[in-house]
């Protein structure tokens, strides 16, 4: 049987959830009049860069555009963005597609989410509301770097 | 239907525990997006917020209280329960459990236990 | 002190259209945060009127509804009926504290 990506809505500890403006990802509060993105996520199948410390290797995309989360270098620092394709495409792929990959951890009940291309960095959100979502190596109180998974299957 | 009880004594001796339990029928504790709600009333004022507890186990207090509280759930039992520890006499209210859904309530309650009223007295 | 300020009581006629109106700040309501609205009967445990500021849960009479602007929030009643006579309480989620806050709450009166 085919592999499916798992569905997700995504949330912070300040109930801040991710949506989609234009083709970038910000942080808004939940709300009814936000409609919030779903995440797509699926295993990736080759293990040329896996870490099992790390976490599971993970390719993340948006249910119902083919957009997908990928890290690149700008101006000399890692920054997340979206790009145009289609997350199955991805994970058909034999050859894991690094910028497109994330390991993604468990604590406690939140999940985390760093980059294959940039260890150490981890996708983040900003404490203030309506910010794009980011990567960061800074790991605390201004960056949230735990979010929750919830089912919306 | 999902319904709400809250159950536990009426009187607490200053400096003592506070424990209280919400029992859940009509409805699973663990329920996706689900989240569990402590908010009290003291006689002839308004509501406060305690705490809260969600489907993940993560709990969230109110800050002015939160190095007494602790919010517990016990799947097995379809229970979540409050402690409030080295009460006073100013913890004296109406305790109500109260629930909601992330995706469907926004983060506010629509169901709602009908309340204990605990006493601190000695 | 409540996070979210509302008057302590407001009053009308029977038939009348009254405001309660609930104000918070940029980590909560201004946050863009959705704010609901409860009424409490005398004896009686809160029952949730409004929610997502402008939404009425089934069997909620069309005569409630609620609007937020800004940092705040109000709900009206218009008809107004002897069985309104109540508190209210509007509620909202704020950010900066982790969690959910209420407005001090007004009493109804109906004249």
């Known amino acids: 049987r085919e592999a499916a990506p798992k569905s997700y809505a995504i949330r912070d500890s300040r109930q801040m959830v991710w949506v989609l403006s234009g083709n970038s990802l910000i942080a808004a509060p939940l709300s009814r009049s936000i409609k919030p993105v779903t995440l797509h996520l699926i295993a990736c199948r080759d293990t040329e860069f896996s870490d099992k410390e790390k976490g599971n290797m993970v390719y993340l995309g948006i249910k119902g555009k083919d957009l997908c989360l990928f890290c690149a270098e700008i101006q000399g620092k890692p920054t997340l963005q979206l790009k145009e394709k289609n997350i199955m495409d991805l994970y058909v792929e034999k050859k894991a597609q690094k910028p497109f990959l994330f390991f993604h951890n468990k604590e406690g009940s939140t999940s985390v989410f760093q980059s294959v291309s940039y260890p150490g960095w981890f996708i983040a959100t900003s404490t203030t509301s309506g910010q794009p979502i980011f990567l960061t190596k800074e790991r605390g109180i201004t960056n949230n770097t735990n979010f929750y998974l919830d089912s919306v299957e | 239907e999902l319904q709400l009880q809250e159950s536990g004594p009426g009187l607490v001796k200053p400096s003592e525990t506070l424990s209280l339990t919400c029992t859940v029928s009509?409805?699973?504790?663990?329920?996706?997006?689900?989240?569990w709600g402590w908010i009290r009333q003291p006689p002839g004022k308004g509501l406060e917020w305690i705490g809260s507890?969600?489907?993940?186990?993560?709990?969230y207090y109110n800050p002015s209280l939160k190095s007494r509280v602790t919010i517990s759930v016990d799947t097995s039992k379809n229970q979540f329960s409050l402690k409030l520890s080295s009460v006073t006499a100013a913890d004296t209210a109406v305790y109500y459990c109260?629930?909601?859904?992330?995706?469907?309530?926004?983060?506010?309650?629509?169901?709602w236990g009908q309340g204990t009223l605990v006493t601190v007295s000695s | 002190e409540s996070v979210l300020t509302q008057p302590p009581s407001v009053s009308g006629a029977p038939g009348q259209r009254v405001t309660i109106s609930c104000t918070g700040s940029s980590s909560n309501i201004g946050a863009h945060y959705d704010v609901h609205w409860y009424q409490q009967l005398p004896g009686t445990a809160p029952k949730l009127l409004i929610y997502g500021n402008d939404n009425r849960p089934s069997g909620v009479p069309d005569r409630f509804s609620g609007s937020k602007s800004g940092t705040s929030a109000s709900l009206a009643i218009t008809g107004l009926q002897a069985e309104d006579e109540a508190d209210y309480y509007c509620?909202?989620?704020?950010?900066?504290?982790?969690?959910?806050?209420f407005g001090g709450g007004t009493k109804l009166t109906v004249l």
């Open positions: 507890i969600d489907y993940t186990g993560s709990t």
């Open positions: 509620q909202s989620y704020d950010y900066s504290l982790s969690g959910y806050v």
């Open positions: 009509g409805g699973s504790i663990t329920a996706s997006n689900t989240y």
């Open positions: 109260a629930t909601g859904k992330y995706y469907e309530t926004y983060l506010g309650f629509d169901v």
